[in-house]
Amino acid sequence: GWVWNQFFVPEEMNTTSHHVGRLRSDLDNGNNSFQYKLLGAGAGSTFIIDERTGDIYAIEKLDREERSLYILRAQVIDITTGRAVEPESEFVIKVSDINDNEPKFLDEPYEAIVPEMSPEGTLVIQVTASDADDPSSGNNARLLYSLLQGQPYFSVEPTTGVIRISSKMDRELQDEYWVIIQAKDMIGQPGALSGTTSVLIKLSDVNDNKPIFKESLYRLTVSESAPTGTSIGTIMAYDNDIGENAEMDYSIEEDDSQTFDIITNHETQEGIVILKKKVNFEHQNHYGIRAKVKNHHVDEQLMKYHTEASTTFIKIQVEDVDEPPLFLLPYYIFEIFEETPQGSFVGVVSATDPDNRKSPIRYSITRSKVFNIDDNGTITTTNSLDREISAWYNLSITATEKYNIEQISSIPVYVQVLNINDHAPEFSQYYESYVCENAGSGQVIQTISAVDRDESIEEHHFYFNLSVEDTNSSSFTIIDNQDNTAVILTNRTGFNLQEEPIFYISILIADNGIPSLTSTNTLTIHVCDCDDSGSTQTCQYQELMLSMGFKTE
């Protein structure tokens, strides 16, 4: 049978030929009659065999990390017969390890983030080195980790590569650290190989700083003309923290006048002082308010850093603005009776300069030929007024400062022209009536109504009468209906077209004004030739028919 021990060849042997071991048949008596052969991958190129002795040699430098075993086949032949002495057999050559690989950190680059002020012992990151040598071969791949840079803030566990905090760190002093870790194989014994890696450790922020005003006093100004909501200036606190931990909120701590407000610009972290109520230089020309600032987000466990909010004082000076004249009222309504003579008094408007210098005021009326105003604000008429032409006047009165004519204010003034009874009532329309020759007494000829151009205080009431002459000799009579209308009736039987073709009746209409006014109005009545039934359709009075729009036969 075959005789051999397990074959080992050390890696990285530089000799041209390294004896690995000997293969032999127990039938080999050493008389050189046997021939040994090596077959398989590596035979002849990596390994050779002495055909006579069966000694195997490695003729190539081997790398265990590349390939750690070779399976070869061996044959032994009797030279004299050419026959196999032993059956072909497989054998294994193992490549034994030497410490020729340094530890390598394959997961580089390393970066870790840990909160500032973390307590001692806090885990930061684990670094792991790999050693290509054989972990089962002595200590060639057994590693020890140590810290080359990073004391006194960090430490590394020698066997695990776990980096921990060994001293509290303040991000506001230093926000990142470079730690250098060394891994040594052979558990650090002589002849060990080493590799290093750098770990960038960044400190994340915790809210351990409150915002603080750098200025204890701010001086701001606001124009008295500024509308509410105006930004009048900014204040700024500083927080050494970053991001969300530096977000702050400003607020008013003291403002007795409740005139100002502070809003926070969360992009710039500035406080914007806002005008909440209009200011008036003449009323108060300076203010003092106190503002405070605190962080927007504060964790419960960090409240100890935020016990007392930082404050600052803000002095606000009101700037005087030359303001336009100010009328006592926003508008005026005056009344004047119609028909009062030119120059009559209408009313007085009054404006003053609100500023301290109290400039005299001049008044004017925009585009009016009917009214005038003097420097005292007295409005008078320049013409007699007729309510029936215009019952209201809308005036625009302008007040101008004498010392600064650009300072102008205008207000509306409404003048109501009051009614006097200066118009008598009159027919509401032109009336032309007719009567049949054969009309009987008491026949209704016409209903009339009246109008009065005057304004009625309560309600117009008109009184209708015939004139004295007509009352005495009239063929007609009038009845007042007591509702501002009256009816005209025949006062006799029968009329003669040839003798009296037309009657002109004078009607008096009086109003209920004080004093009462009366007008005389003429009613024209035509006499018509009518048929027996009294139908006006057959009235043959040509001129009348034409005037009434009838066609004559």
């Epitope: 398989g40 991958a41 590349e66 390939r67 399976i71 394959l106």
Partner: antibody, heavy 120, light 108 residues
Framework: QVQLQESGPGLVKPSQTLSLTCTVS??????????WSWIRQHPGKGLEWIGY???????YYNPSLKSRVTISVDTSKNQFSLKLSSVTAADTAVYYC????????????WGQGTLVTVSS | EIVLTQSPGTLSLSPGERATLSCRAS???????LAWYQQKPGQAPRLLIY???SRATGIPDRFSGSGSGTDFTLTISRLEPEDFAVYYC?????????FGGGTKLEIK
């Protein structure tokens, strides 16, 4: 797990050099115990081993192609490459990259393959 | 170079049947150095068996390998529809590495 992906031109002119790259993901090319190999398959035919490389740069080639083949490795990019010079139409094939277990010689895993056509 | 000869070139069987594929080496090959692969159209080969008889990760137990020296066999005990493909053997016992010509397993 380890994955391999071939890349390179799909068309090469005769007499020129075919160049392919295999990118390894999910593991390091610098791991011991593995060769990184190229295999090709002519259309409708069997598989032919071209050669392999260890991360140290040591190469092993098929003697039938040795004069024209160069395999190289870039451990920083986790890639290895194949160059085949003086190509002819007979080099038209699907080219695969694969990982080889150095002690026992089996291929696992494989890339999905890339067809290279040699034509003018 | 070791030449691997696979037989039959084509094998026609039905699902549920047993398939026996042969791989013969021109020289003796260590069983540690013989592997089998499956290849479906348009796909890369997939490792089935290594060391002549060890199943690769995720390979169903209906696949088995055997043999030594120069004669090696791949057996599929009960064919499933997804098993119809081309099968290759490969050796590492002698340089250069070589593959067999393949056996096409088709549905009957």
């Amino acid at each position: 797990q380890v994955q391999l992906q071939e890349s390179g031109p799909g068309l090469v002119k005769p007499s020129q050099t075919l160049s392919l790259t295999c990118t390894v993901s999910g593991g390091s090319i610098s791991s011991g115990g593995y060769y990184w190999s190229w295999i090709r398959q002519h259309p409708g035919k069997g598989l032919e081993w071209i050669g392999y490389i260890f991360y140290s740069g040591r190469t092993y080639y098929n003697p039938s192609l040795k004069s024209r083949v160069t395999i190289s490795v870039d451990t920083s990019k986790n890639q290895f490459s194949l160059k085949l010079s003086s190509v002819t139409a007979a080099d038209t094939a699907v080219y695969y990259c694969a990982r080889v277990y150095s002690n026992y010689g089996w291929f696992d895993p494989w890339g999905q393959g890339t067809l290279v056509t040699v034509s003018s | 170079e070791i030449v691997l000869t696979q037989s039959p070139g084509t094998l026609s069987l039905s699902p549920g049947e047993r398939a026996t594929l042969s791989c013969r080496a021109s020289q003796s090959v260590s069983s540690s150095y013989l592997a089998w692969y499956q290849q479906k159209p348009g796909q890369a080969p997939r490792l089935l068996i290594y060391g002549a008889s060890s199943r690769a990760t995720g390979i169903p137990d209906r696949f088995s390998g055997s043999g030594s020296g120069t004669d090696f066999t791949l057996t599929i005990s009960r064919l499933e529809p997804e098993d119809f493909a081309v099968y290759y053997c490969q050796q590492y016992g002698s340089s250069p590495l070589t593959f067999g010509g393949g056996t096409k397993l088709e549905i009957k």
